[in-house]
Amino acid sequence: FGISGKHFITVTTFTSAGNIGEDGTLSCTFEPDIKLNGIVIQWLKEGIKGLVHEFKEGKDDLSQQHEMFRGRTAVFADQVVVGNASLRLKNVQLTDAGTYTCYIRTSKGKGNANLEYKTGAFSMPEINVDYNASSESLRCEAPRWFPQPTVAWASQVDQGANFSEVSNTSFELNSENVTMKVVSVLYNVTINNTYSCMIENDIAKATGDIKVTDSEVKRRSQLQLLNS
């Protein structure tokens, strides 16, 4: 009974990372409200005048949107009534990094939460046996990383061994002059062993595993975003 805006509602955000040149999502949820027309979602970015995005009365209102976000943002409109205020961001750029605020107003009240959005580049590594080398070696390649990551090798058999003396890592700038291709070669590998190539920067950690036996080669890779 006329309490709109007087109560605080819970708004939850999640620190996330964006891969430059791809779609990103700024995650935000709130207490659901079945009255769509009464929901206002505002996304703001620290240091930017104007809004990143605004959704109200059941539709987008871009009248106050900052130019750097024009044509690059959208909420998941069909999920707003169930409490999803997340923002889809097109063509993530390095300059999109920063502190964002998700502000919500509903018939139940209002609330807001901040999130740190990191931007960079990260990709899955692929390990192959390099038969061109004079001795058997492994080649670990990942097409896009930024900032420059660290690369380390590990082995199941020689746990704790330092492979820096028997590996060579190079970083090749990609055509857009921001991201880099990572190539690391591990020499003198032995058969019937599992090797791991680990690539890490402050945004993501990726691991590629390869098991080489007399009869087959098994590969596996995984990518994990770091929320620190």
């Epitope: 040149g21 539709k59 024009r70």
Partner: antibody, heavy 121, light 107 residues
Framework: EVQLVQSGAEVKKPGASVKVSCKAS????????IGWVRQAPGQGLEWIGD????????NYNEKFKGRVTITRDTSTSTAYLELSSLRSEDTAVYYC??????????????WGQGTLVTVSS | DIQMTQSPSSLSASVGDRVTITCKAS??????VAWYQQKPGKAPKLLIY???TLQPGVPSRFSGSGSGRDYTLTISSLQPEDFATYYC?????????FGQGTKVEIK
């Protein structure tokens, strides 16, 4: 069902202007960008520009800047392309298309039937 | 502005053939590449967007791939209705750009 219905064929003299309309139905007109593309006889597709009907924001291909104006009328859910100082090279089929992704400018997923504009003295 | 260089400009193929069309962006990296099919006298039809996402209703014999500056449309087994002209579109930047087109003809 998304539908874009364009105005009929036009014949214009060099130096004149033409205004092509594109009436949208089957979705919320103000929530999606609308783009314009042209195709000269026997040639490829050429992006002209687009508009966000919800705010009237526009983007234009540099090649057409100064000669092209894209507008909209939200009361009739209609987008317009106006091209001035026409020359024979502007003879083409002009298409309007809705951009996928709502306020996010996506790829063109629904197209009008095309409007043939002929420029001839 | 980003230009899209499409190749080949035309190709002849038979029903059942595997067909590959490529587009090379003049600069930068983003995944915002779409592919269209156009038949004479008709408006273009969206096949694939965001490099590899198939538009609903498009047969699975069409696939897209690519990264960096190089993007590919593949038709795994050409059907009679696939003879048409294909265009790539770069839509990641403020200014959109089409490739020059590839006409797929019957051998």
């Amino acid at each position: 069902e998304v539908q874009l219905v364009q105005s009929g064929a036009e014949v214009k003299k060099p130096g004149a202007s033409v205004k092509v309309s594109c009436k949208a139905s089957g979705y919320t007109f103000t929530s999606y960008w609308i783009g314009w593309v042209r195709q000269a006889p026997g040639q490829g597709l050429e992006w002209i520009g687009d508009i966000y009907p919800g705010g009237g924001y526009t983007n234009y291909n540099e090649k057409f800047k100064g000669r092209v104006t894209i507008t909209r009328d939200t009361s009739t859910s209609t987008a317009y392309l106006e091209l001035s100082s026409l020359r024979s090279e502007d003879t083409a089929v002009y298409y309007c298309a809705r951009l996928d992704g709502s306020s996010y400018r996506g790829a063109m997923d629904s197209w009008g039937q095309g409007t043939l504009v002929t420029v001839s003295s | 502005d980003i230009q899209m260089t499409q190749s080949p400009s035309s190709l002849s193929a038979s029903v059942g053939d595997r067909v590959t069309i490529t587009c090379k962006a003049s600069q930068g990296f983003n995944k915002y590449v779409a592919w269209y099919q156009q038949k004479p006298g008709k408006a273009p039809k969206l096949l694939i967007y965001y490099t590899s996402t198939l538009q609903p209703g498009v047969p699975s014999r069409f696939s897209g791939s690519g990264s960096g500056r190089d993007y590919t449309l593949t038709i795994s087994s050409l059907q009679p209705e696939d003879f048409a002209t294909y265009y790539c579109l770069q839509y990641g930047n403020l200014l959109y750009a089409f490739g020059q087109g590839t006409k797929v003809e019957i051998k």
